[in-house]
C-alpha cells in the first residue's frame, strides 16, 4: 500500500523592511490569475537571491500570502494584488500561511519515528 | 522547471520583417513574466521588450520602439516578437526569458538578472 502525503499547515507574521531593490519576490494568482484549483489566493512564486525576503529567510516559494499590512488579500484580482505590495510603504507586515508536505507511512500505520502525530 | 524554444529567425534584407516565436514548458504558462533579449558578437546581452503575464503591459528598448511588437498566446504557451522594417543593427542572437509570477517589486524589466529561465536563442541576421 502507498504512504499517504500529508500537509502541515502553520501561519506566521513575517516583518519585512523594503530593501534597495524592493521586498525581492514575485507572486501569483488572484481572481483572473488562479494558480491552485478553487483558489484565487494570493502564492509567492520566486524568492529573489539577495533580496529583502531572501535575507530575512522566512518566507518561501509556495508559501500563501493572507494579508499586507493588515489588509486581506482575499478575492483581487492578481494587477491590484502587485499594486498592494508596491504600495505597502518601507516596512511590509506578512501574514503568510506555509504548507509543509508531510509523507507518512501506509494507510492505517505510523511508522515509528513519524513526528505527525 | 521551464523549458524555452525559440525560433523564426534567418537571413534577411534591410526593411524586411521577421515574426519570432518563443514556446515555453509548463502548466503556469499564463503566470510567466516574459521577455525577449538579444546579443550581437562582441557586446553585452540587450533588452529588447517584455510583456506581463496577461498581455497587457508591454515595454520597448528605444532602439526597437514603433517596430518591433511583443505579443502571447496564453492558449498555446507561446510568446512572439513581431520586428518590422529590420536594419543592420538588429542582427544579433534573440532569447526569450521568463520569471514565474510578476515580481512585487518596481519591475526592471530590462534587467537580465531578473529572469530566471532562458532559450537557446535564435539568430537574425539583417543584411
Known amino acids: 500500500m502507498n504512504g499517504r502525503v500529508d500537509y502541515l499547515v502553520t501561519e506566521e507574521e513575517i516583518n519585512l523592511t523594503r530593501g534597495p531593490s524592493g521586498l525581492g519576490f514575485n507572486i501569483v494568482g488572484g481572481t483572473d490569475q488562479q494558480y491552485v484549483s478553487n483558489d484565487s489566493g494570493i502564492y509567492v512564486s520566486r524568492i529573489k537571491e539577495n533580496g529583502a525576503a531572501a535575507l530575512d529567510g522566512r518566507l518561501q516559494e509556495g508559501d500563501k500570502i493572507l494579508s499586507v499590512n493588515g489588509q486581506d488579500l482575499k478575492n483581487l484580482l492578481h494587477q491590484d494584488a502587485v499594486d498592494l505590495f508596491r504600495n505597502a510603504g518601507y516596512a511590509v507586515s506578512l501574514r503568510v500561511q506555509h504548507r509543509l508536505q508531510v509523507q507518512n507511512g501506509p494507510i492505517g500505520h505510523r511508522g515509528e519515528g513519524d513526528p505527525s502525530g | 522547471h521551464v523549458q524555452l524554444v525559440e525560433s523564426g529567425g534567418g537571413l534577411v534584407q534591410a526593411g524586411d520583417s521577421l515574426r519570432l516565436s518563443c514556446a515555453a514548458s509548463?502548466?503556469?504558462?499564463?503566470?510567466?513574466?516574459m521577455g525577449w533579449f538579444r546579443q550581437a558578437p562582441g557586446k553585452e546581452r540587450e533588452f529588447v521588450a517584455h510583456?506581463?503575464?496577461?498581455?497587457?503591459?508591454?515595454y520597448y528598448a528605444d532602439s526597437v520602439k514603433g517596430r518591433f511588437t511583443i505579443s502571447r498566446d496564453n492558449a498555446k504557451n507561446t510568446m512572439y516578437l513581431q520586428m518590422n522594417s529590420l536594419k543592420p543593427d538588429d542582427t544579433a542572437v534573440y532569447y526569450c526569458?521568463?520569471?514565474?509570477?510578476?515580481?512585487?517589486?518596481?519591475?526592471?524589466?530590462?534587467?537580465?538578472?531578473?529572469?530566471?529561465?532562458w532559450g537557446q536563442g535564435t539568430q537574425v541576421t539583417v543584411s
Open positions: 509548463g502548466r503556469t504558462f499564463s503566470t510567466y513574466t
Open positions: 510583456i506581463n503575464w496577461s498581455g497587457s503591459s508591454t
Open positions: 526569458a521568463v520569471t514565474i509570477g510578476s515580481p512585487v517589486d518596481s519591475y526592471r524589466h530590462s534587467d537580465p538578472l531578473e529572469y530566471d529561465y
